[in-house]
C-alpha cells in the first residue's frame, strides 16, 4: 500500500516455539468505544507466510464464493482476482453471482512494486471467522495484474481498511469498513494481531497455521498483555501517525523529529518491513551497524539484499539493538515508546543451500514516501485501529517473539514537548499522483 | 515509427461476419493496450471495443457486446475484431489504435495514435 | 451512459484568433477526459488527454482544463493546420463515450 518494498506481508505460527508467549497481566482500563472482552469466533481467523501477508477468509457473492483476502491498512480497495491468472488456485466468478451488479467503471491501482486494474461493482460480502453479517461492499474484480499476485502465498485478493481518501479510482468509492460499519452494528474500529513465526515456514505449515486475529469491532483482552496507548491518527486517509522520537538501545538518534514523519508516517499491515525515510534509514543503520559490531555483515545485508546465517539456534539476539519508536501521545505533550526486538526486524527466511541454518533478512529498509510502520512494527504488538475515536492504540502482543532477556515494550507516559511540529505538511499536489504503497 | 495497418473490411449481409486486423509495427506490441474505433460516414466517433496488454481486461460497448470480440495475437503483433450478426447500424470506418501503456484503466493510457481505417458497409 | 455536449457545434474564426472549445458531461467523469482533432479524410489524433496533459508533440498553443462536468480547450492563436473538427471524449465510466464535436472553420 505503501510505496517501497511491500511484499505483502508475513505472518507465522502464533505462540511460535522458538519464542516465548508473555503471561497475561490483568489491568482495568478505561471503556473504549466497541465491544470489549472475548471475541472466540475472531480470534485466530488470519493466516499468511513471512514476507507474503497476512489474509482472511472471506465470502463474496450468492451463492457465497470463498477466498482468501489479504488484510492492508495502507489501502482502501477490496479487490479480488477475477480472472485465471497462474498465482491463483480460484477466483471470483462475477457471473455466477445472483447479487453482482455492476458499476460500470473501470479501475486502476499502481502500487510501488506492482499494479492492477480491474470493473467495479457491488456484491455481499461476509467474513465467516468475523462478526455475523453480510454487507453490499464495492468489488474491484481485477482482470489485469502485474506483479501483484505472489506465487504460493495462498491469498486471492486484498482488503483495503484505510479511508476513502486514498481509495481508486477516487474518494467517492466507499471502502469496504466504511460500508460495514454504515449497514450494520458493527463498532467503527478493529484491531489487529499479527503473529511473526521467528522461523521460516513451508506451504504446508503455513496452511495448518495461525498467522494472527483480526478482531472486526472491538478489542480482544487474550491478544495482549500490560496496557493499550493510543497516539492520535493524524489525518484520515492512510493510518498516519506522528513519531516524536526514535531511540536504538535507548540512544536518540537526535534527529529533528520532522525527518521521522517526512512526508508522512502510516501503520500499514500490507508492507513487511519498518521503512524509514533516507536520512532516518541512514542515521538508524549506522546506529544499529555500530551497537552489533562485535560481528560484521557484508552491505548487502543492510540494504535487505543478502541474508545472514547462523547455525540452527544459535543467533546472537543479544548483539542486536532494540528499536524504540516514540509516538504522540492523546494528552498534550504526552508521548509513549514502543520498542521491538530483533526478534522483529530481523525476518527469518529459507535458505534453501544450508537449510540446518537460521538465516534473516534486514526488514529495515528504506522509504521515499516516509515511515512505514509495517509487519516489523505490528508483529509486536496488539494493535487497535479505533476510527471511531481517531487514534491507534498499541499494546504488547501476546504472541510476539522474544527470548528470556528482552520483549517487545509499550511504555509511557514520557514528557516531549511541541510535538506538532514533528509532523509534515505535504504541498497539495494532484491526487492522481498519490501511489498506492505495497513492498 | 509507430504503424498500424487495418484489414478485412467490406460489404457484408446484414446478419453476416467479418473479421477485422490491425498489424502493429514499431513498437513492443505485447505491452500496450490497443483498440478499435468506429465512424459512421458523416457521423462522430464511437468506441466499439478495447484490450490490455495480455487480453486480460476488455471493454465492449452496449452496441456490440455478445455480438463483437476483440482478440489479439501477441506473437504476430496482430489485433483482431471478430463481428458476427452484423447489422446496417454497424456500418463504419474501423480504426485500430495503440493505448498508452498495458492498462486499459490507466489514467494517462489514452489511445493514440490511430491507423488509417477500414471500411465495413453492411447492406442487402 | 454519460453524454457528453460539445459547444458550439461549428465555431468560425480567423487565423491568431482564440478558439474557445466547451465539452460538458451528464456526470462527473472526474479528470478522465481526452481531447482529439480530426481533420477530413484522417485518423483523429490525440491532442489533450487527463482533461489537461498535452499529448507528445501537440504544440502548446494547445490547452486543456477543467475537472468533473465542464472541460474547455483552448487553442490560443488558430494556425491554419488547426481548422478541423474536435471530439472530447471520457473513459470514466462504460460505456466510454465522444461528443457530438465541434467544427472550427475558417471564417
Known amino acids: 500500500t505503501q510505496h517501497g518494498i511491500r511484499l505483502p506481508l508475513r505472518s507465522g505460527l502464533g505462540g511460535a516455539p522458538l519464542g516465548l508467549r508473555l503471561p497475561r497481566e490483568t489491568d482495568e482500563e478505561p471503556e473504549e468505544p466497541g465491544r470489549r472482552g472475548s471475541f472466540v469466533e475472531m480470534v485466530d481467523n488470519l493466516r499468511g507466510k513471512s514476507g507474503q501477508g497476512y489474509y482472511v477468509e472471506m465470502t463474496v457473492g450468492s451463492p457465497p464464493q470463498t477466498l482468501n483476502i489479504l488484510v492492508d491498512t495502507g489501502s482502501s480497495n477490496f479487490a479480488v482476482g477475477a480472472a485465471p491468472h497462474p498465482f491463483l488456485h480460484r477466483y471470483y466468478q462475477r457471473q455466477l453471482s445472483s447479487t453482482y451488479r455492476d458499476l460500470r467503471k473501470g479501475v486502476y491501482v499502481p502500487y510501488t512494486q506492482g499494479k492492477w486494474e480491474g470493473e467495479l461493482g457491488t456484491d455481499l460480502v461476509s467474513i465467516p471467522h468475523g462478526p455475523n453479517v453480510t454487507v453490499r461492499a464495492n468489488i474491484a474484480a481485477i482482470t489485469e495484474s502485474d506483479k501483484f499476485f505472489i506465487n504460493g502465498s495462498n491469498w486471492e485478493g486484498i482488503l483495503g481498511l484505510a479511508y476513502a481518501e486514498i481509495a481508486r479510482p477516487d474518494d467517492s468509492l466507499e471502502p469496504f469498513f466504511d460500508s460495514l460499519v454504515k449497514q450494520t452494528h458493527v463498532p467503527n474500529l478493529f484491531s489487529l494481531q499479527l503473529c511473526g513465526a521467528g522461523f521460516p515456514l513451508n506451504q504446508s505449515e503455513v496452511l495448518a497455521s495461525v498467522g494472527g486475529s483480526m478482531i472486526i469491532g472491538g478489542i480482544d483482552h487474550s491478544l495482549y498483555t500490560g496496557s493499550l496507548w493510543y497516539t492520535p491518527i493524524r489525518r484520515e486517509w492512510y493510518y498516519e501517525v506522528i513519531i516524536v522520537r526514535v531511540e536504538i538501545n535507548g540512544q536518540d538518534l537526535k534527529m529533528d523529529c520532522k525527518e521521522y514523519n517526512y512526508d508522512k508516517s502510516i501503520v500499514d499491515s500490507g508492507t513487511t518491513n519498518l521503512r524509514l525515510p533516507k536520512k532516518v534509514f541512514e542515521a538508524a543503520v549506522k546506529s544499529i551497524k555500530a551497537a552489533s559490531s562485535t560481528e560484521k555483515f557484508p552491505d548487502g545485508f543492510w540494504l535487505g539484499e543478502q541474508l545472514v546465517c547462523w547455525q540452527a539456534g544459535t543467533t546472537p539476539w543479544n548483539i542486536f539493538p532494540v528499536i524504540s519508536l516514540y509516538l504522540m501521545g492523546e494528552v498534550t505533550n504526552q508521548s509513549f515508546r514502543i520498542t521491538i526486538l530483533p526478534q522483529q526486524y530481523l525476518r527469518p527466511v529459507e535458505d534453501v543451500a544450508t537449510s540446518q541454518d537460521d538465516c534473516y533478512k534486514f526488514a529495515i529498509s528504506q522509504s521515499s514516501t516516509g515511515t512505514v510502520m509495517g509487519a516489523v512494527i505490528m508483529e509486536g504488538f496488539y494493535v487497535v485501529f479505533d476510527r471511531a475515536r481517531k487514534r491507534i492504540g498499541f499494546a504488547v502482543s501476546a504472541c510476539h517473539v522474544h527470548d528470556e532477556f528482552r520483549t517487545a515494550a509499550v511504555e509511557g507516559p514520557f514528557v516531549t514537548l511541541d510535538m506538532e511540529d514533528c509532523g509534515y505538511n505535504i504541498p497539495q499536489t494532484d491526487e492522481s499522483t498519490l501511489m498506492t504503497g505495497r513492498a | 515509427e509507430v504503424q498500424l495497418l487495418e484489414s478485412g473490411g467490406g460489404l457484408v449481409q446484414p446478419g453476416g461476419s467479418l473479421r477485422l486486423s490491425c498489424a502493429a509495427s514499431?513498437?513492443?506490441?505485447?505491452?500496450?493496450?490497443m483498440g478499435w474505433v468506429r465512424q459512421a460516414p458523416g457521423k462522430g466517433l464511437e468506441w466499439v471495443s478495447a484490450t490490455s496488454g495480455s487480453g486480460g481486461s476488455t471493454y465492449y460497448a452496449d452496441s456490440v457486446k455478445g455480438r463483437f470480440t476483440i482478440s489479439r495475437d501477441n506473437s504476430k503483433n496482430t489485433l483482431y475484431l471478430q463481428m458476427n450478426s452484423l447489422r446496417a447500424e454497424d456500418t463504419a470506418v474501423y480504426y485500430c489504435?495503440?493505448?498508452?501503456?498495458?492498462?486499459?484503466?490507466?489514467?494517462?493510457?489514452?489511445?493514440?495514435?490511430w491507423g488509417q481505417g477500414t471500411l465495413v458497409t453492411v447492406s442487402s | 451512459e454519460i453524454v457528453l455536449t460539445q459547444s458550439p457545434a461549428t465555431l468560425s474564426l480567423s487565423p491568431g484568433e482564440r478558439a474557445t472549445l466547451s465539452c460538458r458531461a451528464s456526470q462527473s467523469v472526474s479528470s478522465y477526459l481526452a481531447w482529439y482533432q480530426q481533420k477530413p479524410g484522417q485518423a483523429p489524433r490525440l491532442l489533450i488527454y487527463?482533461?489537461?496533459n498535452r499529448a507528445t508533440g501537440i504544440p502548446a498553443r494547445f490547452s486543456g482544463s477543467g475537472s468533473g462536468t465542464d472541460f474547455t480547450l483552448t487553442i490560443s492563436s488558430l494556425e491554419p493546420e488547426d481548422f478541423a473538427v474536435y471530439y472530447c471524449v471520457q473513459r470514466s465510466n462504460f460505456p466510454w463515450t465522444f461528443g457530438g464535436g465541434t467544427k472550427v472553420e475558417i471564417k
Open positions: 489504435a495503440k493505448g498508452g501503456s498495458q492498462w486499459l484503466y490507466a489514467p494517462g493510457s489514452w489511445f493514440d495514435p
Open positions: 514499431g513498437f513492443t506490441f505485447s505491452t500496450y493496450a
Open positions: 487527463d482533461a489537461s
